[in-house]
Interface confidence: low
């Protein structure tokens, strides 16, 4: 009696269990009473990456220079390429289709996690005690200078955006 | 056609810059990443780094980081050099390459097109 | 970084003989995906670097068919069948795995 369902890494047709081609390959032709499942090595810049009975394998993604994007790991015949964004510049989804630039920080406010390739900067605001003065995707929140330590005084309150202002003591008269 | 035309021979004083541009055209510029690779008089081939001309992303070599810049106008499609701090032995014939970049083979990126050369003398 | 090591680094021939040219890296060249990351460029007297062979052994655009390469891992070989006085300067091989790309020293091929 013909089998109505098959083994791992087998696929029913004809009434009968042909084997799958491995990761790396697709399907030629397939198998017969007579015959195994005849498979072929993708192309140089082709990939499968299950065992399968595709006719065509896959393409590489292309990482298009246009769109910021590089190499971050050669296909083979078993992967896909991998892109990933230029230096400065973050993944705009998961699969890293095109790239943006990374976020600065206003003043106000501070780095709280630096992008990477794949998510943009995190920001968050300068808490009372710490400032930051500049627009930037890597300077965090710096603290407001300690006057006291210098041997100084506070002049000049500080802001979520300025340092205070230190200045020596008044002159005793 | 597709082409590299580089700027004349520089003749520069130790410690000083010089900077060399190349420019491209009969292709899309920003398509194509941009090396620089130099050779000494009897010395044999080395590579500096590259520039991505699309988003000006860079990769030096290490021996030149902290002395090379490249960067790029898109809008007049050229790449430029410049070497800081010139040392008598940066004595060289510096060429612009442009690296093939696509799908076939297997994305592997070669140098096909080169510029005709920029002779930079270091001499004081 | 990768070292390359070309020999002979002269190489007199005479017209219509073949010549060879080795080249050996101090790593694997071979990646993942079977292919090597290996190139040949020749540096003709007056000109700029011209691709001849990628991949270790295929054939550049325009290349003419007696340059042929061949090898795997960390050992190549460019081959010139019936050499041509056109073919005399300087063969270098260059890996192009990992940045930075690096050359071989240079093989001189000058006609007897």
């Known amino acids: 009696e013909p089998p109505t369902a098959c083994r791992e890494k087998q696929y029913l047709i004809n009434s009968q269990c042909c084997s799958l081609c491995q990761p790396g390959q697709k399907l030629v032709s397939d198998c017969t009473e007579f015959t195994e499942t005849e498979c072929l090595p993708c192309g140089e810049s082709e990939f499968l990456d299950t065992w399968n009975r595709e006719t065509h394998c896959h393409q590489h993604k292309y990482c298009d220079p246009n769109l910021g994007l590089r190499v971050q790991q050669k296909g083979t015949s078993e992967t896909d390429t991998i892109c990933t964004c230029e230096e400065g510049w973050h993944c705009t989804s998961e699969a890293c289709e095109s790239c943006v630039l990374h976020r600065s920080c206003s003043p106000g406010f501070g780095v709280k996690q630096i992008a990477t390739g794949v998510s943009d900067t995190i920001c968050e605001p300068c808490p009372v005690g710490f400032f930051s003065n500049v627009s930037s995707a890597f300077e965090k929140c710096h603290p407001w200078t300690s006057c006291e330590t210098k041997d100084l005084v506070v002049q000049q309150a500080g802001t979520n955006k300025t340092d205070v202002v230190c200045g020596p003591q008044d002159r005793l008269r | 056609q597709v082409q590299l035309v580089q700027s004349g021979a520089e003749v520069k004083k130790p410690g000083a810059s010089v900077k060399v541009s190349c420019k491209a055209s009969?292709?899309?510029?920003?398509?194509?990443?941009m090396h620089w690779v130099r050779q000494a008089p009897g010395q044999g081939l080395e590579w500096m780094g590259w520039?991505?001309?699309?988003?000006?992303?860079?990769n030096y070599a290490q021996k030149f980081q902290g002395r090379v810049t490249m960067t790029r106008d898109t809008s007049i499609s050229t790449a430029y050099m410049e070497l800081s701090r010139l040392r008598s032995d940066d004595t060289a014939v510096y060429y612009c390459?442009?690296?093939?970049?696509?799908?076939?083979?297997?994305?592997?990126?070669?140098?096909?097109?080169w510029g005709k050369g920029t002779t930079v003398t270091v001499s004081s | 970084d990768v070292v390359m090591t070309q020999s002979p680094l002269s190489l007199p021939v005479t017209p219509g003989e073949s010549a060879t040219i080795s080249c050996r890296s101090s790593?694997?060249?071979?990646?993942?995906?079977?292919?090597?990351?290996l190139d040949w460029y020749l540096l003709k007297p007056g000109q700029s670097p011209q691709l001849l062979i990628y991949?270790?052994?295929n054939r550049a655009s325009g290349v003419p068919d007696r340059f042929s390469g061949s090898g795997s891992g960390t050992d190549f070989t460019l081959k010139i069948s019936r050499v041509e006085a056109e073919d005399v300067g300087l063969y270098y091989c260059?890996?192009?795995?990992?940045?930075?790309?690096?050359f071989g020293q240079g093989t001189k091929l000058e006609i007897k």
């Open positions: 260059m890996q192009g795995l990992e940045t930075p790309y690096t």
């Open positions: 009969g292709y899309t510029f920003t398509g194509y990443y």
């Open positions: 790593q694997s060249l071979l990646y993942s995906n079977g292919y090597n990351y």
């Open positions: 390459a442009r690296e093939r970049v696509g799908a076939t083979p297997t994305y592997y990126y070669y140098m096909d097109v």
């Open positions: 520039i991505n001309p699309n988003s000006g992303g860079t």
């Open positions: 991949l270790g052994s």
